[in-house]
Amino acid sequence: ECVTQLLKDTCFEGGDITTVFTPSAKYCQVVCTYHPRCLLFTFTAESPSEDPTRWFTCVLKDSVTETLPRVNRTAAISGYSFKQCSHQISACNKDIYVDLDMKGINYNSSVAKSAQECQERCTDDVHCHFFTYATRQFPSLEHRNICLLKHTQTGTPTRITKLDKVVSGFSLKSCALSNLACIRDIFPNTVFADSNIDSVMAPDAFVCGRICTHHPGCLFFTFFSQEWPKESQRNLCLLKTSESGLPSTRIKKSKALSGFSLQSCRHSIPVFCHSSFYHDTDFLGEELDIVAAKSHEACQKLCTNAVRCQFFTYTPAQASCNEGKGKCYLKLSSNGSPTKILHGRGGISGYTLRLCKMDNECTTKIKPRIVGGTASVRGEWPWQVTLHTTSPTQRHLCGGSIIGNQWILTAAHCFYGVESPKILRVYSGILNQSEIKEDTSFFGVQEIIIHDQYKMAESGYDIALLKLETTVNYTDSQRPICLPSKGDRNVIYTDCWVTGWGYRKLRDKIQNTLQKAKIPLVTNEECQKRYRGHKITHKMICAGYREGGKDACKGDSGGPLSCKHNEVWHLVGITSWGEGCAQRERPGVYTNVVEYVDWILEKTQAV
C-alpha cells in the first residue's frame, strides 16, 4: 500500500541496505524511491539529543514483509518509498538548504553573484551533483560569494554539516533545465575507451543507455551485444566517465554499441521504464517467487504488482501442462539489473513497469496517429479536454489540455464573464460532444488561475490553469501531454497539430467530433508582418499555411497546439487568437507555452 506521510520521532529497526546523507527527510524519501531495493528509510534530523555525526543520515532499508518494527527515537523521521505509490514522482529538487554544507569532492571553485547563479553553474556542468555557496555574510572574507561545485560516487553528499552563512542545493539536470548538449544517437560498432565506473548486465543498448542516464556518475556507455566475440562480456553494459565529460577515444569494434547519458535531456524520453519483452532470453537473479501465469504479459503484470520484483523470466507452458499456464519467475538483484543474461533457453524476460511512473506519464507511447482526414479517432489526443459552462445552459466553452493529474492548461480569455468555477465542467476522454449526457462523469473545477498580467488575448499572457476538484486517473483515453522544456527553446517542431471542437469556418457551429489539422509553425518575424497592427511577442507562437485553409477557430480556444519531437508529444501552444479563421496570410496566434513553464510550475507546485 502507498504511505506518503512521514513518521516523526520514529525509527525503523533493522533491514539496513546502505546509509547516505540527505539534507531533509523529504529528499531521503526520494533517494529511497530511486534506489533499486529500498522500501523504507529512517532519517535523522539535527537535534541537540543526537550525536552531530548522525545528523542528516538517511538509512535505506528493505524488508521481505515490506515493513519493519517501529521504535520511538527523538529526531528520527521514518517513512516508505514511493515505489508502492501510483502517483508520478520526480528526482527534481529545487530546494535550497540554508546553513548546510553538503560535502563531496570540490572540483571547481569560482565567484558567483548569487546562490541561483551557483545552482545554474552546477546544472550546466557535466560532473556537478550539488553545490555549496558562501553568501556575502560568510565570516571569511576570501570565501565570500564562492561557489563550490561538487560530485560524489553516489550523487548524494558524503556528509552534511551545519555551517553558518552558506547555502547548498542540487543540480537541476533532472528538472530538464541544463544547457548541456545532449547526444541521443547510439553509435553502432563503437567502443568508448574511457574509465569504467560500473558495469551491469543489459539485454540491449537502449536499456544500457537508460541505466547510464539515471546512474549518477555515468556520462556515456559501451554495450557489448550478444554476438560479441568474448562470451564472458556478452550483454555487458559498461558505464563510463571522463574528465572532459566526453569520450577521449572511439574505437571501431564490431558487435559493440556506444552512446551517452541523457541526463541533460531526460524530460522528453522515458529513462526508467524498460517496457520491451526479450524473447529466448533468461534473466538470472535472486528468486523472489515462482507463480503460474498465462502469458509473458501476465507475468510482467505480476512482477509490476510485486513491489520487490525488478525483472522476470517467463517459461511458456509445455503443451497441455498446468491448464496452459507457464511459470513466471519473479526476480531481483542488488542493482536492479540481471546478474547474468542467457540466450537460447526459450524464456521470455522483461522488467517491472513499476518504474514507469518515475518517468513523466506524458512520455508514454500513445496510439499511432491516423494519417489523413480531419476527424480524430478515440484516444488519438488523450490530453484534449472539453470545458463546458453550465450557465445559462450547458455548452462547450473552450478546449484545454491535461498537464497533471489535477491540472488543465487553457487560455485566459475563455473565462471572460465566468464569475465562479462552480459553473465549469471538464470532460476528458471525449471524442464526440454528443457523448456528453446528464449522467456523463466530469471533473469539477476547484480554482481558476489566470495569469496576473493577462488583459486581452491579443496582448499576450493568454494562459490559465484549472485546478480540478478530483484527480484524473490516467488511461489510454485520458493522459497528460508533456510541457516543452526550457532546454528545448531551439527545437524546430515540424509535426504540429491543432485540435478542437470549434467552428470549421467563421460562421458555423461547434463540431460534434474532435477535429484535427496539421499546421506548420511560422517564425515570429513572418507572423509580425501579417499582423502589423499587433505586437507579436516572444511569448506568442504562430502557425498556419500561407494560403490559409487550415486553422483553429471559435471554440478551439484554450486547446492544444501539440507537436511531436523525439517520439514525444509536447504542448507547444495554446490556441489564443487570430484574424478570422484560416484566412490567407493570417496565421493563428498561440500562447508560447515554453515561455510560461516557470509560471506553470510555480502555480501547480505551490503547497
Epitope: 545554474e120 550546466d124 557535466v126 548541456l180 548538449a181 565529460g245 566526453l246 577521449s248 572511439r250
Partner: nanobody, 122 residues
C-alpha cells in the same frame, strides 16, 4: 592562455554559402569543446554548432541542421563552419568559443573570438 581568431564572414545572397574559420592558438589541448555561437541585433547569443575536440562528436541547433557543417583540422588547430542555403534569419555576428563543457550555454565557454559578421541579403 587561448586565443581564437575568426574569419570568413561577409555579405551573401539568400541561398548562398560561406565558410567560417576559427584559428586557435595557445593552450588549446585543455579545451574539450569548440563551438560556434551567433548573435543577431537585439537578440540573445545562441549556440549554432558544437564539436568535441578529441572525439569529434558534433551537435547542431535545429534551425541549421542539414545546412551547416562544423568540422575541425587538428593539424592546423582550426575549426570550420560551412554554411549552405543561407537565409536572411542567419544574419548575425558569429563567434567562435572554446571551453571544457559540451554545452549550449555561452557561460560554459571560457575563451571567445572577436566575432565575424555574416549578412544574408539580396
Amino acid at each position: 592562455q587561448v586565443q581564437l581568431v575568426e574569419s570568413g564572414g561577409g555579405l551573401v545572397q539568400p541561398g548562398g554559402s560561406l565558410r567560417l574559420s576559427c584559428a586557435a592558438s595557445g593552450y588549446t589541448y585543455s579545451m574539450g569543446a569548440m563551438a560556434w555561437f551567433r548573435q543577431a541585433p537585439g537578440k540573445e547569443r545562441e549556440g549554432v554548432a558544437l564539436i568535441a575536440t578529441s572525439s569529434g562528436f558534433i551537435s547542431y541547433t535545429d534551425s541549421v541542421k542539414g545546412r551547416f557543417t562544423i568540422s575541425q583540422d587538428n593539424s592546423k588547430n582550426t575549426v570550420y563552419l560551412q554554411m549552405n542555403s543561407l537565409r536572411a534569419e542567419d544574419t548575425a555576428v558569429y563567434y567562435c568559443a572554446a571551453g571544457t563543457q559540451f554545452s549550449w550555454s555561452p557561460g560554459s565557454y571560457n575563451y571567445w573570438g572577436q566575432g565575424t559578421l555574416v549578412t544574408v541579403s539580396s
